[in-house]
């Protein structure tokens, strides 16, 4: 009988006939070992490879270019899955990006993405997307034109100020651009007029910081 | 290369009106909020006007209020301030200053036009 | 309106030696979220003013490092480590914290 083929991503695993959202083992191309990745397999069909999550602010997410890299966190809770390893995974195939939103008053959202996928760490790991629909704004609040990676010691944004430093986080900052998925968690009350909370600037606002996040990936042709 | 270039002053007589205009380049210019910053002669700086990205939302000082409007034109990427009723204390240079972050997070200024001198006097 | 206040109004120093320069505000300049929106700009004679420091003390980007923004609340410092000739100008600084912006009435440095 000839040899299952390992699982490249989340919709591999629900193909496989794992249909139940929860944590898998996943082996990307090019990259030495294989990664834990959360597997959202209820959300639209299914087959959802989390790239991002949080939900509770027991993570500290002001890291550095190094830890933004290669993963930070459990992919049981808040996480950040890696640069190399969201480079890697969107090379294999095309891929598309949901990202499920709730603000702090129980609503909940999503923006999604018909193409995604990042450069490589010399491309500052830039962002690439095209066809944005969703509940979470009529605009985009990714930045649709290209943007490259910041964290607090690499400074790759469009702006005369370091957006990394003075909104907390990794992300694909502009000037400093409409959101920042990876800024500073603040709980109910505490979540209005921040300047680097957790934004999605079509969804809530310039300064609302929300309540939890999700960023996923699928395959186009699932 | 961020530009602000203006243009529109000259001499005018007290009461008359001028409009003053900034084009941008170089940037997103819908994406920015907007200020016109002054400096009488030999003074100091005094804001006198805001307009957010969309246009949606505007300021003014409360000693141009009732006589100045700003206003914007995304489409042409310019900046623009009409001024009526002028008086002799308008007299200063008038300069447009881009808001330093976009989407309306307010941190100050990060660019400035080169500044345009409006001289009221009869 | 909040009235905010430089000290001194004029500086002479010597290229090479340090300069400071104070602002003070007639209220907290201390945001809700934590950051106080106090900038500084520089005016060169004959120019534009520029950025020099946001947010009290970051520095905008291809501001030498010898600039340095320190305070909180009310009351706030410019420090230049090491003047040089091209430090020359009307040291401004404005706050945004509380509206309508309002900056205070300007630092001449000069090149003794």
């Known amino acids: 009988r000839e040899e299952e083929k390992p699982f490249r991503d989340c919709a591999d695993v629900y193909q496989a006939g794992f249909n139940k959202s929860g944590i898998y083992t996943i082996y990307i191309n090019n990259m030495p070992e294989p990664k834990k990745v959360f597997c959202n397999m209820d959300v639209n069909g299914g087959g959802w490879t989390v790239i991002q999550h949080r939900e509770d602010g027991s993570l500290d997410f002001q890291r550095g270019w190094k830890e933004y890299k290669m993963g930070f966190g459990n992919p049981s809770g808040e996480y950040w899955l890696g640069n190399e390893f969201i480079f890697a995974i969107t090379s294999q195939r095309q891929y598309m990006l949901r990202i499920e939103l709730m603000d702090w008053e129980g609503n909940r959202a999503y923006s999604q993405y018909d193409r995604f996928h990042i450069g490589n760490e010399k491309q500052n790991y830039r962002l690439y997307l095209k066809g944005h629909t969703g509940t979470a704004g009529k605009q985009s609040s990714l930045i649709l034109h290209g943007a490259d990676f910041s964290t607090k010691d690499a400074d790759n944004d469009n702006c005369m100020c370091k957006c990394a430093l003075m909104l907390t986080g990794g992300w694909w900052f502009d000037a400093c651009g409409p959101s920042n998925l990876n800024g500073m968690f603040y709980t109910a009350g505490q979540n209005h007029g921040k300047l680097n909370g957790i934004k999605w600037h079509y969804f809530k606002g310039p300064s609302y910081s929300l309540r939890s996040t999700t960023m996923m990936i699928r395959p186009l042709d699932f | 290369e961020v530009q602000l270039v203006q243009s529109g002053g000259g001499v005018v007589q007290p009461g008359r009106s001028l409009r003053l205009s900034c084009a941008a380049s170089?940037?997103?210019?819908?994406?920015?909020?907007m200020h016109w910053v002054r400096q009488a002669p030999g003074k100091g700086l005094e804001w006198v006007s805001y307009i957010s990205s969309s246009g949606s939302t505007i300021y003014y000082a409360d000693s141009v209020k009732g006589r100045f409007t700003i206003s914007r034109d995304n489409a042409k990427n310019s900046l623009y301030l009409q001024m009526n009723s002028l008086r002799a204390e308008d007299t200063a240079v008038y300069y447009c200053a881009r808001d330093l972050l976009d989407y309306d997070i307010w941190t100050g200024y990060g660019y400035w036009g080169q500044g345009t001198l409006v001289t009221v006097s009869s | 309106d909040i009235v905010m206040t430089q000290s001194p109004l004029s500086l002479p120093v010597t290229p090479g030696e340090p300069a400071s320069i104070s602002c003070r505000s007639s209220?907290?300049?201390?945001?809700?979220?934590?950051?106080?929106?106090l900038d500084w700009y520089l005016q060169k004679p004959g120019q534009s003013p520029q950025l020099l420091i946001y947010l009290g003390s970051d520095r905008a980007s291809g501001v030498p490092d010898r600039f340095s923004g320190s305070g909180s609340g009310t009351d706030f410092t410019l420090k230049i480590s090491r003047v040089e000739a091209e430090d020359v100008g009307v040291y401004y600084c404005m706050q945004g914290t509380h509206w309508p912006p309002t900056f205070g009435q300007g630092t001449k440095l000069e090149i003794k």
């Open positions: 209220q907290s300049l201390l945001h809700s979220n934590g950051y106080n929106y």
């Open positions: 170089g940037f997103t210019f819908s994406s920015y909020g």
